[in-house]
Amino acid sequence: EEELQMIQPEKLLLVAVGESATLNCTVTSLLPVGPVLWFRGVGPGRELIYNQKEGHFPRVTTVSDLTKRNNMDFSIRISSITPADAGTYYCVKFRKGSPENVEFKSGPGTEMALRAKPSAPVVSGPAARATPEHTVSFTCKSHGFSPRDITLKWFKNGNELSDFQTNVDPAGQSVSYSIRSTARVVLAPWDVRSQVTCEVAHVTLQGDPLRGTANLSEAIRVPPTLEVTQQPMRAGNQVNITYQVRNFYPQNLQLTWLENGNVCRTETASTLTENKDGTYNWTSWLLVNTSDQRDDVVLTCQVKHDGQLAVNKSLVLEVSAHQKDQSSDATH
């Protein structure tokens, strides 16, 4: 006669919390006489899940009528699945015996894993801003998903990135898993308006991945370019000094005017003009009266951007020889 086979067709069963799970098991022979029991796990500590003859299993129902004479289907349904139900389930044939039934053959087992969606990815940027051409790291985190298999991708402005490292924890069996990925992005001057996106794909999402984004504007500092120009006024004894601060980000900027080393004015950037790339421009004017100057004037403009060290730009205002003579006369 043919040797009894225990058939558990599903190797893996994915079930969401609260759902019912059907664990399939069929046998190929009615012999030897004896019951089929369900266990979770293996070894001495395996847990009895269902025994038709004895015990109380309120969440377990049989798919077929086990009392039927020629029944060969020993599948069971477990209701209201919780994370505690995860594990590998075995249907086990016992041979009728006394004083105990004797284990005869076990099925290969069906692993029940909880099907849980990953949380929305959270992307965090670097703790401090960096300037263009430097590399910054962005971290993406998602948790609470099961099974463990998951795909994570990074994009910058829709273009896929390749420089990233991903870890899924824990390494072993668990009720749920978490993912952490760190991407390295080289900053460009125009990245104020750029965005990085972390995209997570998982079997529970039915092909509709979850995304988390971060703006590079939070991570970048574009230092200003400085330009000083002077224009004589029509009156002749006044010079207009124009200080142009161009292409900077963020807006946080303070400008101090010094005349021969003495502070004459401090202002905080306001009424900025925004460029297409998201950087800002700002212009500051200083009107210098040259009529009461007898020596050359050193004008310094000091720019402090986003808490960084101040950058100085100086200009020497040369006083004409005629003015110098007049000044000399006045002192004698």
């Epitope: 395996r46 004797v102 284990e103």
Partner: antibody
Amino acid sequence: QVQLVQSGAEVKKPGASVKVSCKASGYTFTRNYVHWVRQAPGQGLEWMGRINPNSGGTNTAQKFQGRVTMTRDTSTSTVYMELSSLRSEDTAVYYCARLGDVAVAASFDYWGQGTLVTVSS
Amino acid sequence: DIQMTQSPSSLSASVGDRVTITCRASQSISSYLNWYQQKPGKAPKLLIYDASSLESGVPSRFSGSGSGTDFTLTISSLQPEDFATYYCQQANSFPLTFGPGTKVDIK
């Protein structure tokens, strides 16, 4: 052919432990429970307990609970019986025996050759 | 625990004799009874299981009968190799228990 080969004779002091091995061959090791039976010199047979080699689950006679540990190593098809806190009345021949797979009543169709354990100070 | 008793505790018989050994259980054990033969310095050997089923390879001169509390092992025609000690064993409940044995020797 089916064989159960046991480890050699042991002499132990009272209070010590002894571990007897029983190596199975000639059949699928995980398919038959293995029982342990002892026989004191000139006396009858006494059942000690059994192990399911597939799951590792055990059933021990109340008389020996807390003193007997039965284990198995499926990679070598070997079962072990360890008896602790030995006393002189534990001097006996210890047999491993395979549970038959035809009878309903638990019966032993193959036996090891026996291991003599002598407990003496 | 179920107690098993055997009678007689020993008997002397000749080759060719019909020998009967009885075994009694302290409570009903249905047909969950086995018989073993043991020779000096050897392990026991299964003869009869489930009260009356002959183990494979055992000569047909051995037979068993009974159910409930009273059981019998019969050797229809004693042979020289049958001189040994015979044990009954109940398998109705744990712990499994053996009878004290019946020694069959040469008259």
